[in-house]
Every structure is written in structure tokens, then in C-alpha cells.
């Protein structure tokens, strides 16, 4: 595999990671796939410092992150441990609210207008943030 040593055009470097901030919206799964096509992932927030950095760039706008509980427990898309990791939920969240009338609960996490996190319906078209780590060998599978 090849190593990424600098960020792609239009991506922002911060603490040895590259970030890309959308300006339009997609459903969570489509945002996730967008990042994967970029050999990246939806942003995984591992510290208060990273939270502040992302919050500064997205402003007061609902924005998807790489955290979901579509298969039961809350999971970060890159495998970062949720239970022991950084969290920044709004009070009373996540609540898996069913009262929205869209069917099902709320399985995908997003930054709210004040930066704290909320769970919401994954089909909502929110902005999103992609992240990829520098100096990490990309997974280039062998040809069969």
C-alpha cells in the first residue's frame, strides 16, 4: 500500500489528519460512502481539542460524524472504542426518539448548532465531515 504524506487539495490538515468539510447535505449512509470513495471515513472525534477544531470549521450547522448505533451499540466507523472514548452529547441525548414520525428511532450522530452531539434519523440530509490520517498505509488489496 501507499502512504499519504500530505493532504489532498481542498482538505485541511490538523494534527496529522486531513479533514474535508461538505457544504451541502446527504443522508448518513451516502455521506459515509462519499468519504469511503475518498479513502477516508466520516470524522471520528477522539478529544476535546479535535471537537473544537471541527466545530470551528462547521459552524452552527447540523453535521454528520462517523458514529452510529444502527446495529445495536454505538460504534465509531474506524473502530475507535466508543465506551472509553471522548463523548460530547447534548443533555438527555442520545434518546433514540421515535416521535419524529419518519419510522424507527434515531441511529446516527451529528454535531448540533452548538457543537454538542445528538442522535437523529439517518436519512436526514445533513452536511458531513470526512477524515483521513496521514502516514497511514492505505489498504490496497492484492489483485486476484
Amino acid at each position: 500500500g501507499s502512504e499519504r504524506t500530505c493532504c489532498p487539495v481542498n482538505w485541511v490538515e490538523h494534527e496529522r489528519s486531513c479533514y474535508w468539510f461538505s457544504r451541502s447535505g446527504k443522508a448518513w449512509a451516502d455521506a459515509d460512502n462519499y468519504c469511503r470513495l475518498e479513502d477516508a471515513h466520516l470524522v471520528v472525534v477522539t478529544s476535546w481539542e479535535e471537537q473544537k477544531f471541527v466545530q470551528h470549521h462547521i459552524g452552527p450547522v447540523n453535521t454528520w460524524m462517523g458514529l452510529h448505533d444502527q446495529n445495536g451499540p454505538w460504534k465509531w466507523v474506524d473502530g475507535t472504542d466508543y465506551e472509553t472514548g471522548f463523548k460530547n452529547w447534548r443533555p438527555e441525548q442520545p434518546d433514540d426518539w421515535y416521535g419524529h414520525g419518519l419510522g424507527g428511532g434515531e441511529d446516527c450522530a451529528h454535531f448540533t448548532d452548538d457543537g454538542r452531539w445528538n442522535d437523529d434519523v439517518c436519512q436526514r440530509p445533513y452536511r458531513w465531515v470526512c477524515e483521513t490520517e496521514l502516514d497511514k498505509a492505505s489498504q490496497e488489496p492484492p489483485l486476484l
Epitope: 501507499s2 461538505s22 457544504r23 451541502s24 443522508a27 455521506a31 470513495l37 479513502d39 492505505s138 490496497e140
Partner: antibody, heavy 121, light 108 residues
Framework: EVQLLESGGGLVQPGGSLRLSCAAS????????MNWVRQAPGKGLEWVSA????????FYADSVKGRFTISRDNSKNTLYLQMNSLRAEDTAVYYC??????????????WGQGTMVTVSS | DIQMTQSPSSLSASVGDRVTITCRAS??????LNWYQQKPGKAPKLLIY???SLQSGVPSRFSGSGSGTDFTLTISSLQPEDFATYYC??????????FGQGTKLEIK
């Protein structure tokens, strides 16, 4: 000049296999996701498969999932589509297409000339 | 899955005419809409992305508009080389980008 050139099409019996290739030139191949799109005779366009620049992430249309495999060799600037368990309904011109990114928006900005795959006994 | 429906399926027009082709999505796709031109025996060519942005090298007589579910492609003054089939494509559901069935533009 930016260019994509497909090869590997032909006549194959139902249940058979075929491997298509797409040779890229004129751009940094490894930096771009790539797609396969097909067009049955006299019909419209159908997205088939996509792969990220490194090859680490792949995606398929439901109609080909489990039968087709997309891959790439960035050292050879080449994209592949391995097609197994072929059916009559897979008969089509197969195009490779580069994913162009324009801010939030994505489109297929460069296409190959296509290669014809015919599945018939 | 998002379904894309174009109308009309075919139309006849003359050189110099103003032509409009419409595309409707089965759900809101915001502005994630592309237009392609395809001539017989050739690969499709990208004309417009993001509903209204003209791809580099495409003549300014082509324009796109719309958002949500309803979109249009307009050719302000048809030229002989514009007779072709036109496809819309949604790019909302990455990467499963579905196409409309096509609109064949023929010479009257």
C-alpha cells in the same frame, strides 16, 4: 491527454466468466475513484460498480453483487471488472468512468469508449 | 433506491430552436443532478453537474436549473451537433448514481 481505454469484451456463454480492463492515462490514476457503467443494446445507462483510489473500498449494484468484482492496479494505471456467472441480461456495452469531484458534487467526467459483452449460447 | 424519470422520451426540433428536457427524482436530491449527452456509438459526455454548473469546455447554450425533485436542461439555440440522447443522473446516493431513461433529440 486524459484517456480511458477498455478491453476484454466478447462473446461468452451463460454461466461463463470474463475480465474487462480499463487502461488510464493523462491523470494521476491512484488519486481518483473509478466506476463501471453499462448500457444494454438500445437501452439506458446503468451504474455497475465503484472503487476508491487505493482500491480499499468497493461498491456494487444489487444486480451484480456476488458475481462481479471490481479491482485496480495503480502501478499499471489499470481498472478491472471480473465478471462471473454471467447471464443474458448482462449483455451490454461496458464503460469505465472516472469520478470527478466538484466540491460536494460528483459526476463521471471522463469515460472510455466502451467494450461490448455478449452473453449468449 | 432513487428513480429518475425524464420527459419527453423523444422530441423533434430544428436548428436554432430552444429546447427543454425535464428530469424528476423520486425523492429530493437537493442539487445533486448531472446531465450527459450521448451520440450513437459513443460514450456519454458530461455537460452539467450540481444541477446548474457547466462542465469545462461545454458550450454556453447548454444550461441546467432546478433543485429538490424537478430539474431542467435547456439548449438555448440548437446546433446540428446537439442532436443526440440526453441523460440525467442523480449523485445524491453515493455511489449508486442512477440515470434517467434518456431523451432522444431528433432533427425535425
Amino acid at each position: 491527454e486524459v484517456q480511458l481505454l477498455e478491453s476484454g469484451g466478447g462473446l461468452v456463454q451463460p454461466g461463463g466468466s470474463l475480465r474487462l480492463s480499463c487502461a488510464a492515462s493523462g491523470f494521476t490514476f491512484s488519486s481518483y475513484a473509478m466506476n463501471w457503467v453499462r448500457q444494454a443494446p438500445g437501452k439506458g445507462l446503468e451504474w455497475v460498480s465503484a472503487i476508491s483510489g487505493s482500491g480499499g473500498n468497493t461498491f456494487y449494484a444489487d444486480s451484480v453483487k456476488g458475481r462481479f468484482t471490481i479491482s485496480r492496479d495503480n502501478s499499471k494505471n489499470t481498472l478491472y471488472l471480473q465478471m462471473n456467472s454471467l447471464r443474458a441480461e448482462d449483455t451490454a456495452v461496458y464503460y469505465c468512468a472516472k469520478r470527478g469531484v466538484y466540491g460536494d458534487y460528483e459526476a463521471f467526467d471522463i469515460w472510455g469508449q466502451g467494450t461490448m459483452v455478449t452473453v449468449s449460447s | 433506491d432513487i428513480q429518475m424519470t425524464q420527459s419527453p422520451s423523444s422530441l423533434s426540433a430544428s436548428v436554432g430552436d430552444r429546447v427543454t428536457i425535464t428530469c424528476r427524482a423520486s425523492q429530493s436530491i437537493i442539487s445533486y443532478l448531472n446531465w450527459y449527452q450521448q451520440k450513437p456509438g459513443k460514450a456519454p459526455k458530461l455537460l452539467i453537474y450540481g444541477a446548474s454548473s457547466l462542465q469545462s469546455g461545454v458550450p454556453s447554450r447548454f444550461s441546467g436549473s432546478g433543485s429538490g425533485t424537478d430539474f431542467t436542461l435547456t439548449i438555448s439555440s440548437l446546433q446540428p451537433e446537439d442532436f443526440a440522447t440526453y441523460y440525467c443522473q442523480q449523485s445524491y446516493s453515493t455511489p449508486m448514481f442512477s440515470f434517467g431513461q434518456g431523451t432522444k433529440l431528433e432533427i425535425k
